[in-house]
Amino acid sequence: ARNGDRCPLGPGRCCRLHTVHASLEDLGWADWVLSPREVQVTMCIGACPSQFREANMHAQIKMNLHRLKPDTVPAPCCVPASYNPMVLIQKTDTGVSLQTYDDLLAKDCHCV
Amino acid sequence: ARNGDRCPLGPGRCCRLHTVHASLEDLGWADWVLSPREVQVTMCIGACPSQFREANMHAQIKMNLHRLKPDTVPAPCCVPASYNPMVLIQKTDTGVSLQTYDDLLAKDCHCV
């Protein structure tokens, strides 16, 4: 079996963590977030070939069925396996508040 | 905001649970599973338009960035939110064994 972390599609094409630079405007947050003004958003992007970072048995099944009928069953998808928390300074009716979000920035990725 | 469960793309086109009929051969299990001979595999298939079954804040961010740069950031992806367990009767060196798998059949779906 192939090493689950070696990408057969070529450098950088398989499921991995990417960083995308975004402003509050880009994120649609300008009206309710004060800070940070810009965010390094970490997200999971890339293809999920056979055996690559398979999250579970379901991903394995999905890949096998995708190979049989790809117009019906899509390939597994690159999604966060876990998240890093992030603190936002938000506008409130009375002023500002600090809020921690646990599901905002991807920490690592797998294929489901 | 749109209702998170109303599909704007037309009936059945958005992220939802599908059942795919599969044999042990289809799944690549013929050499190690005895029963069941056929499986009704439940999996998550369909598009993830804006606000549809968004799993978390990350999905919301991903959708916003996808709209800004679709060639860089893919749309959120339809994946299992939870799983149903399934028992397989497996071949072993000494005979057979019953094994429960908790991550095999999707129970419900969301967009990440």
């Epitope: 057969p8 599609l9 070939p49 056979s50 190979r67 009928k69 117009d71 019906t72 899509p74 390939a75 | -």
Partner: antibody, heavy 121, light 106 residues
């Protein structure tokens, strides 16, 4: 640019076997699935099977199980199809065609020029 | 396996005419793909996923359909369109092709 090179023709005897080649260039060989398709004279297209060069996974049309065997040599970016126990029914043009399994739904996007196999004594 | 039936088998048209060829599936499929093949050449992808034109295909071509019925349409046929056109599905295993429609230009 992507190219799939196949030899033009093969003349073979009944009962023997033949190994057809398809040399790929212009892309990462392990990133595309490789299909093989049969076309008999003045007839339509018939899918034989596919191989995923990334892990040697194969699946075959039931009609060709036992007839065709698909393999790859990743070091030379070449796909092969061996056809066994040849009869006149196997006389046809055989195409290899690459397919991006990770951009579905898609078509078989690049095709070789085809190898014409003639089975004759 | 899913059987794809193409009609008509042979289609004769004059330059400038609108042409429609159909592909019917024995069971419902999610998408249809189309290939063009000229004599002595290999098939070329022409339309993928029902309605998307492959690279380099003229805009006079279009594709449509759903379920069991799909069509390839040429709004104004030209001499260079003379060829065989094959439909193909891969919603179900194994992938299958239609028998083809041969387009002749008068």
């Amino acid at each position: 640019q992507v190219q799939l090179q196949q030899p033009g023709a093969e003349l073979v005897r009944p009962g023997t076997s033949v190994k057809l080649s398809c040399k790929a260039s212009g892309y990462t060989f392990t990133s595309y699935w490789m299909h093989w398709v049969k076309q008999r004279p003045r007839q339509g297209l018939e899918w034989i099977g596919l191989i995923d060069p990334s892990d040697n996974y194969t699946n075959y049309n039931q009609n060709f199980k036992g007839k065709a065997t698909l393999t790859v040599d990743t070091s030379s970016s070449t796909a092969y199809m061996q056809l066994g126990s040849l009869t006149s029914e196997d006389s046809a043009v055989y195409y290899c065609a690459s397919y991006d399994g990770y951009s579905t739904p898609s078509a078989m996007d690049y095709w070789g020029q085809g190898t014409s196999v003639t089975v004759s004594s | 396996q899913i059987v794809l039936s193409q009609s008509p088998a042979i289609l004769s048209a004059s330059p400038g005419e609108k042409v429609t060829m159909t592909c019917r599936a024995s069971s419902s499929v999610n998408y249809m793909h189309w290939y063009q093949q000229k004599p002595g050449s290999s098939p070329k992808p022409w339309i993928y996923a029902t309605s998307n034109l492959a690279s380099g295909v003229p805009a006079r071509f279009s594709g449509s359909g759903s379920g069991t019925s799909y069509s390839l349409i040429i709004s104004r046929v030209e001499a260079e369109d003379a060829a065989a056109y094959y439909c193909q599905q891969w919603s179900s295993y194994p992938p299958t092709f239609g028998g083809g429609t041969k387009l002749e230009i008068k």
